[in-house]
Amino acid sequence: EDGGPACYGGFDLYFILDKSGSVLHHWNEIYYFVEQLAHRFISPQLRMSFIVFSTRGTTLMKLTEDREQIRQGLEELQKVLPGGDTYMHEGFERASEQIYYENSQGYRTASVIIALTDGELHEDLFFYSEREANRSRDLGAIVYCVGVKDFNETQLARIADSKDHVFPVNDGFQALQGIIHSILKKSCIEILAAEPSTICAGESFQVVVRGNGFRHARNVDRVLCSFKINDSVTLNEKPFAVEDTYLLCPAPILKEVGMKAALQVSMNDGLSFISSSVIITTTHCSDGS
């Protein structure tokens, strides 16, 4: 990697990309934007999918964490020949389909959608796009929109989770590179560490969850700390404090020495979870220690 900013969050990332006729001479810039961004999401638990839309939606690459498959997916993305209309809702349908199937497996991984389009959506197409984006949200997704050139920011603010989830690129496609840092910062939700990472068996503790993006939730009241104990039972706790770079959470009482709790965070009241490799373990603490 080039040493630029990276994201260590474990979630499902969907790129929904406009390949309508109006982007014909700018596909390289779109591809390069996605490629740069894809390489910066580096958690082994992060899965990625590439979806393109014009008059119809196509899933170019289904969700995968396999870096070789992602490399092949990027190769296919580079070969896309744009053409057709801007049926953005067809792209969201393809994302919702995958989220639906992933949710059916029981454990629900958080989903982040980054949708890129140029141009304004005609009234009926805007209606369908907003509706399909809402369906993705109902399934637990966080939706970001990147608008390039002649986009309608008001439309995109309704398709995305909020105005703050829209990335306007007013200077044309060549300016896409300039928003990689900000889109990475905003769309990345990651758990980096827990303090303390070792707690006393049988005692109650508070834990500081260090990371990024915890205030990116549509509603910070819906943020939860989640502890997956010994790979089986999951306990959700409401944090005492939610800041962008940390959460203050009550830790569950783990009765026995050697118990492990894997740390997760939900941005939507437990509908789905961001995973991490951060583990809290218990140890024996003698009286007075």
Epitope: E97, R135, D138
Partner: antibody
Amino acid sequence: QVQLKESGPALVKPTQTLTLTCTFSGFSLSTSGMGVSWIRQPPGKALEWLAHINLDDDKYYSTSLKTRLTISKDTSKNQVVLTMTNMDPVDTATYYCARGGYGDMDVWGQGTLVTVSS
Amino acid sequence: DIELTQPPSVSVAPGQTARISCSGDNIRSMFVHWYQQKPGQAPVLVIYADNKRPSGIPERFSGSNSGNTATLTISGTQAEDEADYYCSSYDYNAHLVVFGGGTKLTVLG
């Protein structure tokens, strides 16, 4: 647990309209992505999808039969109704309703055999 | 509309691996589902979304999807697996569900 049950006439005359009701329990159509499909199977032949309805009352129909089919739902009664006009002996089949999302149908009714004959 | 093509029949010896194919144009960009149907019974979903197994379905059933072919694999095939198998997928462009023509699996012996 999730259950679906088809009901309707076992015998209809040619040119008549068939009305089939699917009564379901154990799930709600208010889940995003969830819906109910109708599928039929003529004796000794393959499955043929007919129609689908979902939470938002979106209705989708088989291309070859769309002029003859109407699907509707009554969420309060947990029922989905299929009507098929201008019945013909070739429409003789077992008609199934099934719960489904995006093309997958994870629970099926037992099916009801409809014979079209004068 | 998309078309899904299956072989009419497949035979396998007990304990061997049975593979049933389902081909269609660019099928790998779609999700394929597989149903088992025994005589006089309603179909049962055995694989959905290419490779996911519903609860209660034995582990010997698995699925894959690449290129223009999706495959249902039954490893260590048992006599009770003898049935008709149908693949299906959702055609987004026409908003309809398409079934393959079905494959009759015969377990020899």
